[in-house]
Interface confidence: low
């Protein structure tokens, strides 16, 4: 063991006074006590008594459910962490004399910290929000507001935002626009069909009428070779009040691009709140 006076002789007292050094430089896995270096206790053991000039450091193994995870001079071992099942915790890895017990959360819960001292119930995403990332044992559910064209009408820890129903693919029309919390409401396209069919029918009738007029003209042709009298173009009048005439197709007013997405009060980001065990 190197004593302080010896160091003073070796390095020079003046040098020590100008550049104060530790009384002695102990090696790795040693500690300084009473101006001498003693061995640290190895992991899994605690210190019973410091070394002296004549004796080595005395160490004792940690007891059941205790541990020390470093080379140390601790006089007491640490208690293994207790994974309290009443608090939603369970043992992920049993502790040894050199390692602590690692706790994790029961199914449906996640740790709030790396140390996993607490568990929180996986957060549910409120209506208007969908699950972006499902919770794991160490991370909470990540929610995101449903963008325009998507909705969520439930509070869920698993459901993503669903796309609005496409009425067109079902040969239906949008009767009520969707929001971030509600789907669009589709309905039969009676009005639309009428708007399309009626002009077609009248178009056909008009064509038939033209053909009839043409046939009539041909039938009236004189048989002699006299020059044709100059014919005035025949004016065909359609009454203005015919259904479908002069009727503009209705503009389907949609809120695409301007759906209000409102962050619900109290949602983080509880938090919910979240339930936490």
């Amino acid at each position: 063991m190197v004593r302080l006076p010896l160091q003073c002789v070796l390095w020079g007292c003046l040098l020590t006074a100008v550049h104060p050094e530790p009384p002695t430089a102990c090696r790795e896995k040693q500690y300084l006590i009473n101006s001498q270096c003693c061995s640290l206790c190895q992991p899994g053991q605690k210190l019973v008594s410091d070394c002296t000039e004549f004796t080595e450091t005395e160490c004792l193994p940690c007891g059941e459910s205790e541990f020390l995870d470093t080379w140390n001079r601790e006089t007491h071992c640490h208690q293994h962490k207790y994974c309290d099942p009443n608090l939603g915790l369970r043992v992920q890895q049993k502790g040894t004399s050199e390692t602590d017990t690692i706790c994790t959360c029961e199914e449906g819960w996640h740790c709030t910290s790396e140390a996993c001292e607490s568990c929180v119930l996986h957060r549910s995403c409120s209506p208007g929000f969908g699950v972006k990332q499902i919770a794991t044992g160490v991370s909470d559910t990540i929610c995101e507001p449903c963008p325009v064209g998507f909705f969520s009408n439930v509070s869920s820890a698993f459901e993503k935002c669903h796309p609005w129903t496409s009425c067109e693919t079902k040969d239906l029309v949008v009767q009520q626009a969707g929001t971030n919390k509600t789907d669009v409401v589709c309905g039969p396209q009676d009005r639309l069909r009428a708007l399309v069919v009626i002009p077609i029918i009248f178009g056909i009738l008009f064509a038939i009428l033209l053909v009839l007029v043409f046939i009539k003209k041909v039938a009236k042709k004189p048989t002699n070779k006299a020059p044709h009298p100059k014919q005035e173009p025949q004016e065909i009048n359609f009454p203005d009040d015919l259904p479908g005439s002069n009727t503009a197709a209705p503009v389907q007013e949609t809120l695409h691009g301007c759906q209000p997405v409102t962050q619900e009060d109290g949602k983080e980001s509880r938090i919910s709140v979240q339930e936490r065990q």
Epitope: G88, T112, S113, E117, D265, K267, R270
Partner: antibody, heavy 118, light 110 residues
Framework: CQSVEESGGRLVTPGTPLTLTCTVS????????MRWVRQAPGKGLEWIGV?????NTYYATWAKDRFTISKTSTTVDLRIASPTTEDTATYFC??????????????WGPGTLVTVSS | DVVMTQTPSSTSAAVGGTVTIKCQAS??????LAWYQQKPGQPPKLLIY???DLASGVPSRFSGSRSGTEYTLTISGVQREDAATYYC????????????FGGGTELEIL
């Protein structure tokens, strides 16, 4: 406006069961943990227990067999099974603001006074 | 359950002065500590959470700090309206939400 209000506090004789009600407005009990705290006249605050958003209840060790917390969609009840004179206090209901920190309550009711006397 | 030992039980300060209130946790509570202010006839009001975060609407003269298991509330530049009783509330961030209040510190403004 988010608020909580306690009711049901009155003068009771020892042993007569009593239920206090905390009515919440402006937020949902399915999103927050709620706590009950009491304060005896001239004394400090004492934590009784909580009810989680899922409806799980947790009590202080001393309160376990004496109090029961339950809830509906808009109310949280605290039942005192068999009040003693030591239960004379103002009872507060409070919302736990963040689920990851059990100590932090942002909204408190004004309290309701329970007097137990023969 | 955790035990919170709050000191002093009462203190006084002049307007503009500084007040320090301490809370010692019987074991590690990982910064799960809040400070509350209570005036007579009123419910407690949250001042500090997570040991050092200032609650919404609370003046910046209130601050909190932590050193191991000792937590401190400091009021710098005390105002007359700060006369109240202050409580710490510590607890485990666990499912049981088990918490304990300190005994309280009554602050008198001279």
């Amino acid at each position: 406006c988010q608020s909580v209000e306690e009711s049901g506090g009155r003068l009771v004789t020892p042993g007569t069961p009593l239920t206090l009600t905390c009515t919440v407005s402006g937020f949902s009990l399915s999103d927050y943990v709620m706590r009950w705290v009491r304060q005896a006249p001239g004394k400090g605050l004492e934590w009784i227990g909580v009810i989680s958003s899922a409806g799980n209840t947790y009590y202080a060790t001393w309160a376990k067999d004496r109090f029961t917390i339950s809830k509906t969609s808009t109310t949280v009840d605290l039942r005192i099974a068999s009040p003693t004179t030591e239960d004379t206090a103002t009872y507060f209901c409070a919302r736990i603001w963040r689920p990851d920190d059990p100590t932090n309550s942002d909204i408190w009711g004004p309290g309701t006074l329970v007097t137990v006397s023969s | 359950d955790v035990v919170m030992t709050q000191t002093p039980s009462s203190t006084s300060a002049a307007v503009g002065g500084t007040v320090t209130i301490k809370c010692q946790a019987s074991e590690s509570i990982s910064s799960s500590l809040a400070w509350y202010q209570q005036k007579p006839g009123q419910p407690p009001k949250l001042l500090i959470y997570y040991a050092s975060d200032l609650a919404s609407g609370v003046p910046s003269r209130f601050s909190g700090s932590r050193s191991g298991t000792e937590y401190t509330l400091t009021i710098s530049g005390v105002q007359r309206e700060d006369a109240a009783t202050y409580y710490c509330l510590g607890g485990y961030a666990t499912a049981a939400y088990r918490t304990a209040f300190g005994g309280g510190t009554e602050l008198e403004i001279l």
